[in-house]
Interface confidence: low
């Protein structure tokens, strides 16, 4: 009898069972060792099992696959390629599995994959072709709709001698494969900047989460093409002010909600346009929570309470009067 439950409850597969049949081709509905399976829910959970590789004998029915809390280290090309293919796999969660390398074509042969979560893995080496699967200038469109990449930044001493932002963006843009992506989460990655071309090439985005990074400015970022964008999370960054160009672009997005809490806003003369805009706009959620961080005399003032007389800039001293 099959070790897979046909009820909605999960059944576990004993390790000895997997080893006993390892010489034979796996049964299509077999549950891998150290996993729990529910055929009724089309779900397989191999969670917190210290697995070092993706199980080979995943059941063909799987739609939702949880491989969280393991020790996978490397995701090779075709890590999920099977015969027959895992044609129904739609949601794949690999968070917290100590992945430090995702190779080109790691997610190939997953025609229905719509949600992918790689969060909380120290990705020192994310191939530019991890999501596109090929190095062609235009790849076959990826079926991905949601890509969750929160806290994938490796420790500083493990980073390659290249921009981490650049590595991630290269993977997002390769082959224009992710044109259908609707949700992209890049929170908690120490991003210092957002490469200017990234958003222009993800025109289907509905939700973009860049919270808890180190973004200082959005001056060179364009949101103009993101006409479907519904939520933009910029909380907990290092933003000092939003300039007119950015304000106008955000205001022009028909469905947008922007989240700006916990940024160190500098309330000097350069803030006047943003304060005026905040008083007018409906796009900023919780706008009455935004407070000044600098200069010291303005600290904790609520931006919406400010008037133009509050927002002054100290005159620039001639060089002879400046002190270091």
């Amino acid at each position: 009898s099959s070790p897979t439950s046909s009820a909605s409850s999960f059944s576990s597969s004993a390790p000895f069972l997997a080893s006993a049949v390892s010489a034979q081709p796996p049964l299509p509905d077999q549950c891998p060792a150290l996993c729990e399976c529910s055929e009724a829910a089309r779900t397989v959970k191999c969670v917190n099992r210290n697995l070092t590789e993706v199980p080979t004998d995943l059941p063909a029915y799987v739609r939702n696959l949880f491989l969280t809390g393991n020790q996978l280290a490397v995701l090779p090309a075709g890590a999920f390629a099977r015969r027959p293919p895992l044609a129904e796999l739609a949601a794949l969660n690999l968070s917290g599995s100590r992945l430090d390398e995702v190779r080109a074509g790691a997610f190939e042969h997953l025609p229905s994959l719509r949600q992918l979560d790689l969060s909380h893995n120290p990705l020192a080496d994310l191939s530019p072709f991890a999501f596109s699967g090929s190095n062609a200038s235009v790849s076959a469109p990826s079926p991905l709709v949601e890509l969750i990449l929160n806290h994938i930044v490796p420790p500083e001493d493990e980073r390659q001698n290249r921009s981490f932002e650049g590595m991630v963006v290269a993977a997002l843009l390769a082959g224009r494969a992710l044109q259908g992506l609707r949700r992209l989460e890049l929170a908690s990655n120490h991003f210092l900047y957002l490469p200017r071309d990234v958003l222009a090439q993800l025109p289907s985005l509905r939700h973009l989460d860049l919270s808890n990074n180190s973004l200082v400015s959005l001056t060179y970022v364009s949101f103009r093409n993101l006409t479907h964008l519904e939520s933009l999370h910029l909380e907990d960054n290092a933003l000092k002010v939003l300039h007119n160009g950015t304000l106008a672009e955000l205001q022009g997005l028909p469905h947008i909600r922007v989240f700006l809490d916990n940024n160190p806003w500098v309330c000097d003369c350069h803030m006047a346009d943003m304060v005026t805009w905040l008083k007018e706009t409906e796009v900023v959620q919780g706008k009455d929570r935004l407070t000044c961080a600098y200069p010291e005399k303005m600290r904790n003032r609520v931006l919406l309470e400010l008037n133009s007389a509050d927002l002054d800039c100290d005159p620039i001293l001639p060089p002879s009067l400046q002190t270091s």
């Epitope: 008083k279 007018e280 706009t281 409906e282 009455d288 929570r289 600290r299 904790n300 003032r301 609520v302 919406l304 309470e305 400010l306 008037n307 509050d310």
Partner: antibody
């Protein structure tokens, strides 16, 4: 349930000082500003100032800048207002009120201060 | 400072009728989308209670017979139908800039 418990009524001499307290409960104390509002008998409301419960940063109505001093004790989740150089003009009910960012969401019961020789 | 002027100073209304209280700011406290005007109710011997934020947003728990409207410099609080428990003084408050200021209050009585 949010509650703001203010100290009892005070009768003080002209020229003296008084320190009022406001003890908070029922919410995350450090997440909100605490405001103080003055109401003279039979009259309207005047905003005195506010204090950030998390870092003691204050902001005052210029009219009260030399009259009131706001402080906070996070360990006892209590905010204080000291009024100095009291005159009969300072006789009033003083309310602490928890901020709702741009309004006063919750109010204490008020402390009556009477300045009389 | 922005000066808030309420009228009338007192108002007597029959039960079940409409009470209308006006508040005028000495400068605009609105943008095209938001009005930074809020209303409070203070019953005799009690602390003020928040009724309405942003000129027209009813606080939870406040009866639907209360409504607020207006923009720019002119704002109105309506109570309809007036009930016995509405006997109180009503205050408007702006939060356009520091210092926040209140109107002088309107005392509502029953005829």
């Amino acid at each position: 349930e949010v509650q703001l418990q203010e100290s009892g009524a005070e009768m003080v001499r002209p020229g003296a000082s008084v320190k009022l307290s406001c003890k908070a409960s029922g919410y995350t104390f450090t997440s909100y500003w605490m405001h103080w509002v003055k109401q003279r008998p039979g009259q309207g409301l005047e905003w005195i100032g506010k204090i950030d419960s998390s870092d003691s940063k204050t902001q005052y109505n210029q009219k009260f800048k030399d009259k009131a001093t706001l402080t906070v004790d996070k360990s006892s989740i209590t905010v204080y207002m000291e009024l100095n150089s009291l005159t009969s003009e300072d006789s009033a009910v003083y309310y602490c009120a928890r901020g709702g960012y741009l309004w006063f969401a919750y109010w204490g019961q008020g402390t009556l201060v009477t300045v009389s020789a | 400072d922005i000066v808030m002027t309420q009228s009338p100073a007192s108002l007597a209304v029959s039960l079940g009728q409409r009470a209308t209280i006006s508040c005028r700011a000495s400068q605009s406290v609105s943008t095209s989308t938001y009005s930074y005007m809020h209303w409070y109710q203070q019953k005799p011997g009690q602390s003020p209670k928040l009724l309405i934020t942003y000129a027209s947003n009813l606080e939870s728990g406040v009866p639907a017979r209360f409504s607020g409207s207006g923009s720019g410099t002119d704002f109105t609080l309506n109570i309809h139908p007036v009930e016995e428990e509405d006997i109180a003084t009503y205050y408007c408050q702006h939060s356009w800039e520091i210092p926040w200021t209140f109107g002088g209050g309107t005392k509502l009585e029953i005829k």
